[in-house]
Interface confidence: low
């Protein structure tokens, strides 16, 4: 039975009918509705929003919509004992205190339950000591401090600027350096675009604005107390001392007005080079400690936040497939926000809502997708991707057998310049073909395709005439599906011009100023970029759920595998003598990649020729495509990161947001020249090459003729 027998709409109009039903005005209306009050994970307000979404998805026409709840570890400031940082004099008197809250934006002065800026999961503590400025607190920044400048951070409070890498990596690096506290701040160099006003007059960060965020190093574990398993009613929970990924030193974020007060007194060493200087009118001295007249003054942190096991709620909607109901295409994005969530996440949640409404409209007219579509409104993403991870842990056996694809739907915009896509190579051709069919919303590209404007503004560094598509890293809800379960995944949003705007993320990220008005006034007044993102995300889901043959091209994986093998080989070849001494060879990896390329080519030829009317053969070929991503999963996981199991891609060990290729080999090679036991270190490189070569070869064989 073909999918068309389950519908009143002819096949060539299916996608068009779906896309035409998507309306910018609806997305705008939904965004407004979702952003009037805070929806912090674990709060009553966010539970009420979950029930509202459940009710509306049912009205839209989904077959079922359920709430899936979990009891996970969350973190909140103490309402009666606020967090702050002081400068204290030699008598211990506080002569300067950082602000306790962000000045509320116009129109929101009387809103209750705005959580003050804090670093989620910071332990309590009141450390005091000398300050050391550590730039972005990246691995290379600490190398510069410790190895080149001989500055010891042990027992010091470090101050780091936000940006470049995930804040949890900054905290981990500071801990490893022996720091006893971390102050995170937003420097105007990274969060204030020149020539743009600060909110409410523009989209820049005001001096009192502060970025909230979690500082965990979960490495894909989900709830810190129940790694690997769902945090359900009968869960066994670890003690807090054995919890996964919690920081061990107090951490607190501040804005640049407060940072100015701390940094202006800094003494000690001068910054090593201009890359360590931000845009404040301070010397950016590294320290340790304050200069001259202020040398007896210290910095003291006052952190009283608590970790609490709290109930969270995912909303899971189902649109049953007519032909292959046991094959799941998932569209998911989170619902919880730090405050109002004007961009993160509600610009994404509003798009998901409109996509559900459009699919529901088609279903009410008699249509069904070929495969089942699952829609998810995840909770507690901001606290470590907890909602999505717990749900995936609970449903892992179903997902690993039935999961076709996962499309992520967090923030729809982080700018309004061009499209940004990160996805598995299996989806490259799907994204290319889809964007060629969509109209560009960009000024100057009227009547042109989205593919054309995207390619022009964000060209591929390798292939001329094609757009850039990036590797998946982490820091969002696709993580468990891709990195742990090996389900083909992708994400799309509108972004800024990275060439001219070198700030990190968007300036008002995770601040109280991320409001509906920020989007409506400054980013997307016509909601045309939101509509385009809805078309891309929704179109991908539509094709994945409805095409007779899955729209995956395994040949694109072959191309990137060769590129990644070349890259990791060139990194290793920076140590030619050691490679010779320890007999390090990449022959097995290149051989496996060659085999993969040949087998993928032959598979693609068979895919063109097979009898698509034979449901058994069709299912067999589709299963080979579906399970290809799964074949890159190593059940043992990466070293010390058991929940990162994808051998080709993992979040960088130095920046959770970034994807790294052949991460096992990369990490084994990283800083290898400093290892105390070179023989052991190069042995691990050889082992990782072996694992990678085996995995690529094994994946190739899943594409071979079955008998």
């Amino acid at each position: 039975k073909s999918s068309n027998e389950a519908t009143n709409i002819t096949p060539k109009h299916n996608m068009k009918a779906f896309l035409d039903e998507l309306k910018a005005e609806n997305i705008k209306k939904f965004l407004y509705n979702f952003t009037q009050i805070p929806h912090l994970a674990g709060t009553e307000q966010n539970f009420q929003l979950a029930k509202q979404i459940q009710s509306q998805w049912k009205e839209f026409g989904l077959d079922s919509v359920e709430l899936a709840h979990y009891d996970v570890l969350l973190s909140y400031p103490n309402k009666t004992h606020p967090n702050y940082i002081s400068i204290i004099n030699e008598d211990g008197n506080e002569i300067f205190n950082t602000s306790l809250f962000e000045p509320p934006p116009p129109g929101y002065e009387n809103v209750s339950d705005i959580v003050p800026p804090f670093s989620a999961f910071s332990p309590q503590g009141m450390p005091e000591g000398d300050l050391v400025y550590v730039n972005y607190a990246r691995t290379e920044d600490f190398f510069k401090l410790e190895r080149d400048m001989k500055i010891n951070c042990s027992g010091k409070i470090v101050i780091a600027r936000y940006g470049k890498v995930f804040r949890g990596n900054k905290v981990k690096n500071a801990q490893l350096a022996g720091a006893k506290g971390v102050i995170l701040y937003s420097d105007p160099a990274d969060y204030f675009a020149p020539g743009v006003k600060s909110y409410p007059d523009g989209w820049n960060l005001p001096g009192g604005g502060v970025q909230r965020g979690n500082i965990l190093n979960l490495n894909g574990a989900g709830d810190p107390l129940t790694p690997g398993y769902p945090a359900n009613e009968y869960a066994y929970r670890r003690g807090i001392a054995e919890a996964v990924g919690l920081p061990s030193i107090p951490v607190h974020p501040i804005g640049y007005y407060d940072a100015q007060k701390l940094l202006e007194k800094m003494g000690g060493s001068a910054p090593p080079d201009s890359s360590w200087r931000g845009s404040l009118k301070v010397p950016y001295n590294v320290g340790p400690g304050f200069t001259g007249n202020f040398s007896t003054q210290k910095v003291k942190m006052h952190i009283h936040s608590t970790n609490e096991v709290t109930r969270i709620y995912n909303v899971i909607g189902t649109l049953r497939g007519a032909v292959e109901p046991d094959r799941y295409v998932i569209l998911g994005g989170h619902r919880d926000s730090w405050v109002f969530g004007g961009i993160d996440p509600q610009s994404g949640a509003a798009v998901v809502h409109e996509i559900v409404r459009s699919f529901g409209t088609l279903k009410k007219e008699g249509w069904r997708p070929r495969r089942t579509i699952l829609f998810a409104s995840w909770d507690a993403e901001e606290f470590g991707l907890l909602g999505s991870t717990e749900w995936a842990e609970e449903n892992s056996r179903l997902l690993q057998e039935r999961g076709v694809a996962y499309i992520n739907a967090d923030s729809s915009i982080e700018g309004n310049y061009t499209l940004r896509v990160d996805c598995t190579p299996l989806m490259y051709s799907l994204v290319h073909n889809l964007t060629k069919e969509l109209k560009s919303p960009d000024e100057g590209f009227e009547g042109k395709s989205l593919y054309e404007s995207w390619t022009k503004k964000s060209p591929s560094p390798e292939f001329s005439g094609m757009p850039r598509i990036s590797k998946l890293g982490s820091g969002n809800d696709f993580e468990v599906f891709f990195q742990r379960l090996g389900i083909a995944s992708g994400r799309a949003r509108y972004t800024k011009n990275w060439e001219t705007n070198k700030f990190s993320g968007y300036p008002l990220y995770h601040s109280v100023y991320e409001t509906y008005e920020l989007v409506e006034k400054f980013y997307d007044p016509m909601f045309k970029y939101h509509l385009t993102v809805a078309q891309v995300r929704g179109g991908m889901v539509f094709e994945l759920a409805n095409s007779i043959v899955l729209p995956f091209d395994c040949r694109d994986y072959a191309v990137v595998l060769r590129k990644y093998a070349d890259k990791i080989y060139s990194i290793s070849m920076k140590h030619p003598q050691e490679m010779k001494t320890y007999s390090v060879s990449f022959d097995s990896l290149f051989s496996a990649v060659k085999n993969f390329t040949e087998i993928a080519s032959k598979f693609s030829e068979r895919l063109q020729d097979f009898d698509k009317s034979n449901p058994i053969v069709l299912r067999m070929m589709n299963d080979q495509l579906m399970f290809l991503e799964r074949a890159f999963i190593d059940p043992l996981g990466l070293p010390d990161r058991p929940f990162y199991r994808h051998v080709i891609y993992a979040p960088s060990s130095h920046n959770k947001y970034a994807g790294e290729s052949f991460p096992g080999i990369y990490d084994a090679l990283f800083d290898i020249e400093s290892k105390v036991d070179p023989s052991k270190a190069w042995g691990e490189v050889k082992r990782q090459i072996y694992v990678a070569a085996f995995t690529v070869q094994a994946a190739a064989e899943t594409l071979s003729e079955v008998a």
Partner: antibody, heavy 124, light 107 residues
């Protein structure tokens, strides 16, 4: 100034009762677990009891269970220890102490603020 | 009950000496350990929490280390005001228990 000021000690006969008080100032009393710790003459420290911020959870050392009761009045910023059926071995300096939950919202991590201590002597 | 055993029970040292006091738990307590200093007739004072974290206002010559069952308090260079009795305390589970104390006196 953060401080705990104790009162209520004294001499009592075996089997008698005594109520110790501890007045807190300089911090948000209702945000902290509180404790009583004692020290017999010439001996080491012994934890006696803990009470949660809202008084909903209480814990005792086995040797005082059923005889001593820890309580608090957050409106008055005060902590109490009601001691009944006193024995000679209860003779000690009793300290009230603030519990500092430095890592997790648990019931006992470290005692960061201490009262001055009050002597309780149980003797006939 | 988790029993805490401190050693030595007393130590005689001179100003400037490095003094090390050990504390052993009868079962694993992760890093849930605090160290206190007590002078005669005075209330104890918190020095170290979470096994190795220096409480604010405590001189940096005091340091703590260890995890699991074995812990150490080190005074890197003994000062006249450091002559006192030192106690460890576990906060892993109820009942909370203290070590027997180590008296540091003048040699």
């Amino acid at each position: 100034q953060v401080q705990l000021v104790q009162s209520g000690g004294g001499l009592v006969q075996p089997g008698g009762s005594l109520r110790l008080s501890c007045a807190a100032s300089g911090f948000t009393f209702s945000s902290y677990w509180m404790s009583w710790v004692r020290q017999a003459p010439g001996k080491g420290l012994e934890w006696v009891a803990n009470i949660k911020q809202d008084g909903s959870e209480k814990y005792y050392v086995d040797s005082v269970k059923g005889r001593f009761t820890i309580s608090r009045d957050n409106a008055k910023n005060s902590l109490y220890l009601q001691m009944n059926s006193l024995r000679a071995e209860d003779t000690a300096v009793y300290y009230c102490a603030r519990v500092w939950d430095y890592y997790y919202d648990s019931s006992g991590d470290a005692f960061d603020i201490w009262g001055q201590g009050t002597m309780v002597t149980v003797s006939s | 009950v988790i029993w805490m055993t401190q050693s030595p029970s007393s130590v005689s040292a001179s100003v400037g000496d490095r003094v090390t006091i050990t504390c052993r738990a009868s079962q694993g307590i992760s890093s849930w350990l605090a160290w206190y200093q007590q002078k005669p007739g005075k209330a104890p004072k918190l020095l170290i929490y979470a096994a190795s974290n220096l409480q604010s206002g405590v001189p940096s010559r005091f340091s703590g280390s260890g995890s699991g069952t074995d812990f150490t308090l080190t005074i890197s260079s003994l000062q006249p005001e450091d002559f006192a009795t030192y106690y460890c305390q576990q906060a892993n589970s109820f009942p909370l228990t203290f070590g027997g104390g180590t008296k540091v006196d003048i040699k």
